[in-house]
Interface confidence: medium
């Protein structure tokens, strides 16, 4: 069975601000021949032929679907990158999470300016409050953690809020044939 490579992001967020940097890495076993690596952005073949693609000073055109391909393997699953202009941006380790997996949320500010009085909300209800900015960590996500999240905070003297982000936690699929 052909293996699928996977694309990882560093930093690990798929929602970033305009002007930020992110590195996409094509991970897979025994990718010795770097020259046979291919990257696709929104279905178009890129000139990048390395196992990593560095996006520097991200712009809106960098948004979209990224895939990598190695000649001996299937295409990777797509990774979606979204570039925003705003004051606060709610970032998540994943927007679709398997039950039992961890989920991390980060209330990220434009240019990493200091944010105070940070409140995370889920479905309109305040979830957590910190005077200084902190991330939210859910060790074992459950279906009840699904919902619409956003964060608010003070940037300088101004009240700011992020756009909402839908998080879906799905039950782990147990293949009924896996024991056979």
């Amino acid at each position: 069975v052909p293996q699928k490579p996977t694309v990882s992001l560093n930093p690990p967020w798929n929602r970033i601000f305009k002007g930020e940097n992110v590195t996409l890495t094509c991970n897979g076993s025994n990718f010795f021949e770097v020259s046979s690596m291919k990257w696709f952005h929104n279905g178009s073949l890129s000139e990048v032929a390395n196992s990593s693609w560095n996006i520097v000073n991200a712009d809106f055109e960098d948004s979209g679907e990224y895939k990598c391909q190695h000649q001996q393997f299937d295409d990777s699953e797509p990774v979606h990158l979204e570039v925003f202009s705003d004051w606060l941006l709610l970032q998540a380790s994943a927007e679709v999470v398997m039950e039992g997996q961890p989920l991390f949320l980060r209330c990220h500010s434009w240019r990493n300016w200091d944010v105070y009085k940070v409140i995370y909300y889920k479905d309109g209800e305040a979830l957590k409050y910190w005077y200084e900015n902190h991330n939210i960590s859910i060790t074992n996500a459950t279906v009840e953690d699904s919902g619409t999240y956003y964060c608010t905070g003070k940037l300088w003297q101004l009240d700011c809020e992020s756009e909402p982000l839908n998080i879906t936690v799905i039950k782990a699929q147990h293949d009924k044939y896996w024991l056979q």
Epitope: S63, E82, W87, G124, T148, Y150, E161, P164
Partner: antibody, heavy 120, light 108 residues
């Protein structure tokens, strides 16, 4: 300056799909959120939903099951589809721009609106 | 949903009058409150954003105030072109974004 222009049929039959397009001129569709709002005759304003240039959407929960908003960045257009329409969907439909900078979060530019009547 | 309630629903006033329209949110919306003016057959026009900031090109006789749940739009000296319907709108994150029911300002 930036202008928005709605286009689409003015008459739609019940149970069919209402389709409208908003063309943005004088600015790139990037960097903003693009909105659909409607106003039934003699009534107030109702937010239908928005789309970001990258394709992220957010819909009014009361219409979510029937609405799709899409964007064509290369054409500088975004579109509204409202399925299974009834007479209650008869309204003036406006497209608008939402500015997220300077803590505006307001609809600062509007199209002139297009009247859609649902009738057999 | 966050409910926005405007008062009064309609108002008669004369040129030169000082007019105040209020808007109340069913929960705190910080300062995410905007005001629009709509004339018959026209699209709404943004007057005030973020509760108190005047949109570019809008006459200074319009002003906004408030935070949390209670907001006010004031027209310091009514002009003939100000007779219209006014809407408040909250733009807080939880969908849906909602408008007040409108205040119709008529000539006395």
């Amino acid at each position: 300056q930036v202008q928005l222009q709605e286009s689409g049929p003015g008459l739609v039959k019940p149970s069919e799909t209402l389709s409208l397009t908003c063309t943005v001129s004088g600015d790139s569709i990037s960097d903003y959120y693009w909105i659909w709002i409607r106003q039934p005759p003699g009534k107030g304003l109702e937010w239908i939903g928005y789309i970001y240039y990258s394709g992220s959407t957010n819909y009014n929960p009361s219409l979510k099951s029937r609405v799709t908003i899409s964007v064509a960045t290369s054409k500088n257009q975004f579109s509204l589809k409202l399925r299974s329409v009834t007479a209650a969907d008869t309204a003036m439909y406006y497209c608008a721009r939402r500015n997220n900078w300077n803590h505006v979060r307001a609809f600062d530019i509007w199209g002139q609106g297009t009247m859609v009547t649902v009738s057999s | 949903d966050i409910q926005m309630t405007q008062s009064p629903s309609s108002l008669s006033a004369s040129v030169g009058d000082r007019v105040t329209i209020t808007c109340r949110a069913s929960q705190s919306i910080s300062s995410y409150l905007n005001w629009y003016q709509q004339k018959p057959g026209k699209a709404p026009k943004l007057l005030i954003y973020a509760a108190s900031s005047l949109q570019s090109g809008v006459p200074s006789r319009f002003s906004g105030s408030g935070s949390g749940t209670d907001f006010t739009l004031t027209i310091s000296s009514l002009q003939p072109e100000d007779f219209a319907t006014y809407y408040c709108q909250q733009s807080y994150s939880t969908p849906p974004i909602t408008f007040g029911q409108g205040t119709r300002l008529e000539i006395k």
